[in-house]
C-alpha cells in the first residue's frame, strides 16, 4: 500500500528523462499569466512644485502570457546528481484579458531622472545632469505607453549623457529573448528530499547582494518542493525577481479541482523590520530611508539593479509600515488580493496553483542641484506598478493527477 505509493512517488518526482515531474518541469503544462496594474499619477505638477502627496489611480489588469517557453540547456550531472538549465523569458500580450492595449498612456515617475539622481551623488555631476535633464525637456514625471514602461524606450535625457550608460529604460528591459539562470538544482536521484532544491544560481551559492544569511540561495524556485510536504514545514524558495530567498508557511487546506492541496502563504513576518523579526537585519541595507531599520514592508534591491533605487513590496504596500505609504494617496491594501500564496499538492510537492504578487517602486529624493527635484521636501518610494503572476493546473492535468496520484492514495 503506502510503501509502494511512496516508492512510486519518489521515482516519479526525480528530475530526469522519463518521469512525470521532468516532463512538466522542462515545460510547464500550466498556463501562466502575469497581470499588471499601473499606478497612474493624477497630480504630477503639485508633487513636483509643492512636494504634495502623490495621488495614484491603479489601471489594469494588462495581461501577458508568460513562462510558456521550455527550459534551455538542460544538462544532467551524474556526478553530483544535479541538473542545470536556463529559464527563458517571454511575454505575449493578451488583449482579451486586458482592460486596454499596450499603447495606453500612463503618467509615471521619470525612471531615468530618479535613478540618475540617486546613482550620481556628486554635486557637480548632478549639475551636469540638471543641464541634460533641462535640455532634453525631461521632468520628474513622464507619460509613457504600457509597452514602453514595461519593455523599454529610448530615454531622451539619457541619450544626452556622454557615456557609459545604456539609453534604453524599462521596468523589465531587457526581457524577451533573455533567460534567467543558469540554475543548477538537485535532481533527487540520490536523495529525494533534495529534489528541485537549488544548488547554485549563476554558478554561485550566494547572491553577493546581502550580508550574512540573507545572501543565501535557499530552497527551490517554488514551482515544486521535495515530496511529502508537512503542514508544519517552512517552505524556502528563491525568487530572482526580488533578488532574495524567502519562505512560505501553511495557512489552510484547499480543494483544487478535486485535489486536496495545502495553501502556503508568505507571512507578514517575512516583511517585518528587524525590530520585530531580528532575522531580517541583513535585509536592511541603509539607515536613512529605512529610518534606522524601523520601516518595514519594502525591500531595497538597488544592489541587484546596478545601483538603480528599486524597492520591492507587496501590492498597495500590504504589510508595510505607515511611513512608507503615508506620502501616497489612493492605495487600498487587502490580503486576499495582494498577498502571495502557493497551493501545493503535499504528496508530490508540486505547486498546482499559485499567485505571486509584488509591486515595483522607485525611490526619488530631493536634489538641490536638479531643478525638477529641487522642491521636494521628502523622500518618496513611488509605486510604479504591481503584478499578479498566476498559474492553475488545467482540467485535463487535474484529472490525470486525481487518477494517478491522489485517487490511488484515497
Amino acid at each position: 500500500g503506502d510503501l509502494l505509493i511512496q516508492k512510486t512517488i519518489k521515482k516519479q518526482v526525480v528530475l530526469e528523462e522519463g518521469t512525470i515531474a521532468f516532463k512538466n518541469w522542462v515545460k510547464t503544462g500550466t498556463e501562466v499569466y502575469r497581470q499588471f496594474w499601473i499606478f497612474d499619477v493624477q497630480n504630477p505638477q503639485e508633487v513636483m512644485m509643492n512636494s504634495s502627496n502623490i495621488q495614484v489611480k491603479q489601471r489594469g489588469p494588462y495581461t501577458y502570457r508568460v513562462r510558456f517557453l521550455a527550459k534551455e540547456n538542460v544538462t544532467q550531472d551524474a556526478e553530483d546528481n544535479t541538473v542545470s538549465f536556463l529559464q527563458p523569458n517571454g511575454a505575449i500580450f493578451e488583449p482579451s484579458l486586458s482592460v486596454g492595449t499596450e499603447a495606453d498612456n500612463f503618467t509615471v515617475l521619470n525612471l531615468a531622472v530618479a535613478a540618475a539622481s540617486h546613482i550620481y551623488q556628486n554635486q557637480f555631476v548632478q549639475m551636469i545632469l540638471n543641464s541634460l535633464i533641462n535640455k532634453s525637456k525631461s521632468s520628474m514625471f513622464q507619460v509613457r505607453t504600457l509597452r514602453e514602461l514595461l519593455w523599454g524606450y529610448r530615454d531622451p535625457f539619457l541619450s544626452l549623457v556622454p557615456y557609459p550608460v545604456t539609453t534604453t529604460v524599462g521596468l523589465f528591459y531587457p526581457y524577451n529573448n533573455t533567460a534567467d539562470g543558469v540554475y543548477k538544482v538537485f535532481n533527487g536521484k540520490d536523495n529525494i528530499s533534495k529534489v528541485a532544491i537549488i544548488d547554485t544560481y549563476k554558478g554561485k551559492r550566494n547572491l553577493s547582494y546581502w550580508e550574512s544569511h540573507c545572501d543565501m540561495i535557499n530552497g527551490t524556485d517554488a514551482a515544486s518542493f521535495p515530496p511529502f510536504v508537512e503542514k508544519s514545514q517552512v517552505l524556502q524558495f528563491f525568487s530572482s525577481d526580488i533578488c532574495r530567498s524567502i519562505y512560505a508557511v501553511f495557512e489552510s487546506d484547499v480543494n483544487l479541482k478535486g485535489i486536496p492541496v495545502y495553501r502556503f502563504v508568505l507571512p507578514s513576518k517575512a516583511f517585518a523590520s528587524p525590530v520585530e523579526n531580528p532575522d531580517n537585519y541583513c535585509f536592511c541595507t541603509e539607515k536613512i530611508i529605512s529610518k534606522n531599520c524601523t520601516s518595514y514592508g519594502v525591500l531595497d534591491i538597488s544592489k541587484c539593479k546596478e545601483g538603480r533605487p528599486v524597492y520591492i513590496s507587496l501590492p498597495h504596500f500590504l504589510y508595510a509600515s505607515p511611513d512608507v505609504s503615508e506620502p501616497i494617496d489612493g492605495l487600498n491594501p487587502n490580503e486576499e488580493e495582494h498577498r502571495t500564496y502557493l497551493d501545493i499538492e503535499p504528496i508530490t510537492g508540486f505547486t498546482l496553483q499559485f499567485a505571486k504578487r509584488l509591486q515595483v517602486n522607485l525611490l526619488v529624493k530631493p536634489s538641490e542641484k536638479i531643478q525638477v527635484l529641487k522642491n521636494l521636501k521628502r523622500n518618496y518610494i513611488v509605486p510604479i506598478l504591481w503584478l499578479n503572476e498566476t498559474g492553475t493546473i488545467g482540467d485535463e492535468k487535474a484529472n490525470m493527477f486525481r487518477s494517478q496520484v491522489t485517487g490511488k492514495i484515497n
Partner: antibody, heavy 119, light 112 residues
C-alpha cells in the same frame, strides 16, 4: 594617445592676471571633466575647480572663488584657467587633469604650468 | 572641507621590503550610493602626479600588482608589497566623494 598639453612657465607681475591653457588630445573632449590643481611646496596639492566642457558647467573650491575662472573651447579642445589679482601666494605649479564626467579620479595629468609672480 | 591625514610623513624603506601608508579622513567618504572615491597618486620629483589606485582598491591600468589599496569609511591604506627603486617619490591620498575634493599632505617614500 591621451594627452593634456600645458605651457611650461608664466612670469607675471603682482596685481596682473594670467590665462593658462590646457590642450586635450586623444579623447572626446566633451565627455570628460577638466580639473585644475595647484601645487606649492608649503600647501601640497589643492583642487581649484572643475569644468565640464560639454556645456560649460563649473564648480570651484570656496578658496578659489573669485580668484580662478575656468572656461573651455570645444572647437580647439582647450581648457583655460584665468587667475586674477595675482600675489606671491599664487606662485605655484598648476596642473590640468581630467576625470570622467561622472567620476572623480584623475587618470590623465598635464605636465603643469609653473607660475611665478614677481615684480 | 574633508581633511585627509596621511601617516607617516616620511617612510624610509629597504628595497624589497613592504611599505604601508595610512590615510584617514575627517568624516566618512562613502557616498549614499555606496561608492567611495578614495584614490592614491604617486608623484616623482619633477613630474606630475600619476593615478595608482581608484575607488579604494582598484588598480589603474599599467600599475604593477605590488600596489594594493584597502580600507573603508574613514581609514584607508596603500601597500607596496616589494619596494623597487622606481617606486620612490611622494604618495598622496585623495577623496572625491565630497566637494571640494581634497588631497592628503603626502608621504615621502625614500631609501633607508
Amino acid at each position: 594617445q591621451v594627452q593634456l598639453q600645458q605651457p611650461g612657465a608664466e612670469l607675471v607681475k603682482p596685481g596682473a592676471s594670467v590665462r593658462m591653457s590646457c590642450k586635450a588630445s586623444g579623447y572626446t573632449f566633451t565627455n570628460y571633466n577638466m580639473h585644475w590643481v595647484k601645487q606649492t611646496p608649503g600647501q601640497g596639492l589643492e583642487w581649484i575647480g572643475v569644468i565640464y566642457p560639454g556645456n560649460g558647467d563649473t564648480s570651484y573650491s570656496q578658496k578659489f572663488k573669485g580668484k580662478a575662472t575656468l572656461t573651455a573651447d570645444k572647437s580647439s579642445r582647450t581648457g583655460y584657467m584665468q587667475l586674477s589679482s595675482l600675489t606671491s601666494e599664487d606662485s605655484a605649479v598648476y596642473y590640468c587633469t581630467r576625470s570622467g564626467w561622472d567620476d572623480w579620479f584623475f587618470d590623465v595629468w598635464g605636465a603643469g604650468t609653473s607660475v611665478t609672480v614677481s615684480s | 572641507d574633508v581633511l585627509m591625514t596621511q601617516t607617516p610623513l616620511s617612510l624610509p624603506v629597504s628595497l624589497g621590503d613592504q611599505a604601508s601608508i595610512s590615510c584617514r579622513s575627517s568624516q566618512s567618504i562613502v557616498q549614499r550610493n555606496g561608492i567611495t572615491y578614495l584614490e592614491w597618486y604617486q608623484q616623482k620629483t619633477g613630474q606630475s602626479p600619476k593615478l595608482l589606485i581608484y575607488k579604494v582598491s582598484n588598480r589603474f591600468s599599467g600599475v604593477p600588482d605590488r600596489f594594493s589599496g584597502s580600507g573603508s569609511g574613514t581609514d584607508f591604506t596603500l601597500k607596496i608589497s616589494r619596494v623597487e627603486a622606481e617606486d620612490l617619490g611622494v604618495y598622496y591620498c585623495f577623496q572625491g566623494s565630497h566637494v571640494p575634493p581634497t588631497f592628503g599632505g603626502g608621504t615621502k617614500l625614500e631609501i633607508k
